[in-house]
Interface confidence: medium
């Protein structure tokens, strides 16, 4: 029950996280104009990964996509790529985890298969969350660097006739959404990995050692026998000398050249 709850909660948390990553990627407020020195202004600028927007004091907002620009810095392209990779991995993870949920029965899917799928989706969520956190952090670092460069330029008047009064930019809402969403996806992924351990069968029934008696000659069949705890269903695998009678496990094995001497 606890495993099902952990898996279900991991799924829900990851779902919320991935929805947040998608929202953050699409949002326009990745960076907003710093109004510290100019709290009352006719226009307010804010930017996202895909377009730049201007909001006038009247409330009228106009946005323009970056495809109209002459050049995009590699860092911005990298942030875009990280966010998209995060979304894609997260979406695949969600798809896999739906089939892995213990509360959903699909045909005769074994617990071991569900455990593997849960682990796969968990790892995908972890990587997805890390991609989102990395993307947002790279952008934030870029903003901080530009902010302090602008501040230095504002007071030193660097660069001759280059503008001395700078418009500086600070963290937008999308950055916080991205950090939280990435964190949630990461936590959801960890929960799925924990649930995987509980889903995996504690012991697997392997082919046991069996003997076939034919008169006085005894045949030994080397099989894929592995040491077990000595408890549970493995105790069924007994040595049988009743002239070819087979255990339940032995019925599943195929004849090989070692079956008869």
């Amino acid at each position: 029950m606890a495993v099902t709850a952990c898996q279900g909660l991991g799924f829900v948390v990851s779902l919320i996280g991935i929805a947040g990553i998608i929202a953050a990627t699409c949002m326009d407020q990745w960076s907003t104009q710093d109004l510290y020195n100019n709290p009352v202004t006719a226009v307010f600028n804010y930017q996202g990964l895909w377009r730049s927007c201007v909001r006038e004091s009247s409330g009228f907002t106009e946005c323009r996509g970056y495809f109209t620009l002459l050049g995009l810095p590699a860092m911005l392209q990298a942030v875009r790529a990280l966010m998209i990779v995060g979304i894609v991995l997260g979406a695949i993870g969600l798809l896999v985890s739906i089939f892995a949920l213990k509360c959903i029965r699909i045909g005769s899917m074994e617990d071991s298969a569900k455990a593997n799928m849960t682990l796969t989706s968990g790892i995908m969520f972890i990587v997805s969350g890390l991609c989102a956190i990395a993307g947002v952090s790279v952008f934030a670092n870029m903003l901080v660097t530009n902010f302090w460069m602008s501040t230095a330029n504002m007071y030193t008047g660097m660069g001759g006739m280059v503008q001395t009064v700078q418009t500086r930019y600070t963290f937008g809402a999308a950055l916080f959404v991205g950090w939280v969403a990435g964190g949630l996806t990461l936590i959801g992924g960890v929960m799925m990995c924990i649930a995987c351990r509980g889903l995996a069968p504690e012991e697997t029934n392997y082919k046991a050692v069996s003997y076939h008696a034919s008169g006085h000659s005894v045949a030994y069949k080397p099989g894929g026998f592995k040491a077990s705890t000595g408890f549970g269903s493995n105790t069924k695998n007994k040595k049988i000398y009743d002239g070819g009678a087979r255990t339940e496990d032995e019925v599943q094995s195929y004849p090989s050249k070692h079956d008869y001497v």
Epitope: N45, S52, R64, L69, L70, G71, L76, M142, N146, Y169
Partner: nanobody, 129 residues
Framework: QVQLVESGGGSVQAGGSLSLSCAAS????????MAWFRQGPGKEREVVAT????????YYTDSVKGRFTISRDADKNRVYLQMDSLKPEDTAMYYC??????????????????????WGQGTRVTVSS
């Protein structure tokens, strides 16, 4: 609203220099991206150089790289275009343009004329061989 007035145009011999100036007035807070465009006789209007309102690198079209320099003086609300080693093919009407959009992380200002909301009347530059 932003008003732009260009000055500094004229006639010059090939290899000579000219300095164009663009004075912005009105709500200059709008003018984030500033650019110089030109339109030669029988040609399309093309971007020459652009500059951001922040601490970012300017952009130059390939044909003027190393010869032209764009700069901006925010205190005087002016944008300049220093043109050196002029060629006859630089003969055109030069326009100053302002765009109210800004791009904070090193994105170069746009070079599509349709994006620029505010335009000056233009100043003529003639380079004779």
């Amino acid at each position: 609203q932003v008003q732009l007035v260009e000055s500094g145009g004229g006639s010059v011999q090939a290899g000579g220099s000219l300095s164009l100036s663009c004075a912005a007035s009105g709500d200059t807070f709008h003018s984030k991206c500033m650019a110089w465009f030109r339109q030669g006789p029988g040609k399309e209007r093309e971007v020459v150089a652009t500059i951001q309102s922040g601490y970012y690198r300017p952009y130059y079209t390939d044909s003027v790289k190393g010869r032209f320099t764009i700069s901006r003086d925010a205190d005087k609300n002016r944008v300049y275009l220093q043109m050196d080693s002029l060629k006859p093919e630089d003969t055109a009407m030069y326009y100053c343009a302002a765009d109210r959009f800004t791009y904070p992380y090193g994105v170069i200002c746009g070079g599509i004329s349709a994006n620029y909301r505010y335009w000056g009347q233009g100043t003529r530059v003639t380079v004779s061989s």
